[in-house]
């Protein structure tokens, strides 16, 4: 949030030289008026009166909704997730139709024995959930399921996923190649057939800081940009202080217009400043330039 | 849920016969596997035979191949080990287990359903 700039006079003076008596109003902002029954409000930018103030749309607030927010809150997940479809053939257990009930004692049975299976298989992945039969069929069983994935949002997730597939990927290709059947009998808790195991399809959380800014920012987007800190994304226009993208107007006012961040300086009693970043004072006695 | 109930051990002298029956219930099927394991003390369980109860297959191990006879009353739904020729090393205590499912295994871990032991103890 801005910080209010104590000053001794109430004019601004925009970097380009125009002064302006405040409040200030971008005048290159669109403006619509809000009217409801006999309260005629001036809530621009869409915003509506509701009996008391303007309701004002992200990105605008003030009396008015006339001017533009510094930061937009912007949610990311608590965690995001990848969804692996897998099939697997199991040995050890012959089909019966009974099976393809997922009420049945059998499914039910099956269900508990393959998911025990899954965890061993998948114990030193510290994404893997668990998994979820989707499908059971003839073949000795042919097992489709899901295997579930998550991790705590970071800017990195999709890599972090990533590389867990990879990981699950070996770790089933490694136990239906290991846990096969000798003799006609399984000595493991399960046996597959190395030849069923097949990927079909992987689903990653698709979420993007940087999209979801750039839409709540509306006809801002190309002046909002995305900055981390302590690897939680901020949606942030270059008039929030504290980010690399800090606009620093010294001694004047940050504002958003449709044009971009720009300063208005402030006049002072002995001094009124001037430049792009309000940086040049010029005392009023004297008339020199010192910065 | 599945139950299962031993019983029929006892001691025996090398060369005689036990039968052992291990009576089952509730089962929603009369199509599932059943099972006799065996552990002697300081040794790991093992499975002695298993029998699929709609005959589609049984399993000895090799050690009492011949010896020993596995078979299911599906009337009863009771299990039966018939043991001849017994000798001092088939001295354990011996399970039955039951799985709802067709199961080829011979795991312990894969048999999700357990009776009690029944002791059997064959002396020289």
């Known amino acids: 949030p801005l910080a209010t700039i104590p000053v001794s006079t109430t004019s601004l003076t925009s970097s380009e030289g125009s002064t302006i008596s405040t409040p200030s109003v971008d005048i290159s902002t669109p403006v619509t008026t809000s009217i409801v029954g006999d309260q005629c409000s001036r809530c621009k930018n869409g915003g509506f009166w509701d009996g008391l103030k303007c309701q004002c749309l992200t990105p605008y607030y003030g009396e008015s909704c006339e001017e533009v927010v510094n930061s937009i809150d912007i949610a990311p997940p608590e965690t995001v997730s990848a969804q692996m479809e897998l099939t697997v053939t199991v040995t050890s257990v012959k089909f019966t139709d009974e099976l393809k009930n997922h009420s049945s004692q059998e499914f039910r049975e099956f269900n508990k024995t393959f998911t025990e299976q899954m965890n061993i298989v998948y114990s030193g992945i510290p994404e893997y959930v668990g998994v979820n039969i989707t499908n059971l069929r003839l073949g000795s069983v042919v097992v489709e399921h899901d295997v579930l994935l998550r991790t705590k949002y970071t800017p990195e997730y999709k890599t972090a996923l990533d590389n867990a597939t990879e990981v699950v990927k070996q770790k089933i290709t490694k136990v239906t190649t290991e846990q096969i059947m000798t003799n006609d009998n399984c000595s493991a808790l399960m046996c597959f057939n190395t030849t069923g195991t097949q990927v079909q399809n992987i689903t990653v959380t698709q979420y993007d800081p940087v999209e979801e800014c750039r839409q709540k920012a509306e006809e801002y987007e190309d002046y909002f940009l995305v900055e981390y800190r302590d690897q939680k994304p901020y949606c942030i226009s270059p008039c929030e202080s504290g980010f690399n993208a800090s606009k620093n107007c010294n001694h004047g006012k940050c504002q958003m217009s449709q044009n971009g961040a720009r300063c208005l300086c402030v006049t002072t009693e002995t001094h009124w400043y001037s430049g792009e970043d309000c940086n040049q004072g010029t005392q009023k006695s004297h008339h020199h330039h010192h910065h | 849920d599945v139950q299962l109930q031993a019983s029929g051990g006892g001691s025996v002298q090398a060369g005689g016969s036990l039968r052992l029956s291990c009576a089952a219930s509730g089962y929603t099927s009369n199509r599932y596997s059943m099972a006799w394991f065996r552990q002697a003390p300081g040794k790991e369980r093992e499975v002695v035979a298993f029998i699929w109860t709609d005959g589609g297959r049984t399993y000895y191990a090799d050690s009492v191949k011949g010896r020993l006879t596995i078979s299911h009353d599906n009337a009863k739904n009771t299990l039966y080990l018939q043991m001849d020729s017994l000798k001092p090393e088939d001295t354990a205590m011996y399970y039955c287990?039951?799985?709802?499912?067709?199961?080829?295994?011979?795991?312990?871990?894969?048999?999700?359903?357990w009776g009690q032991g029944t002791q059997v103890t064959v002396s020289s």
């Open positions: 287990a039951a799985s709802s499912l067709l199961l080829q295994t011979i795991n312990p871990r894969a048999w999700p359903y």
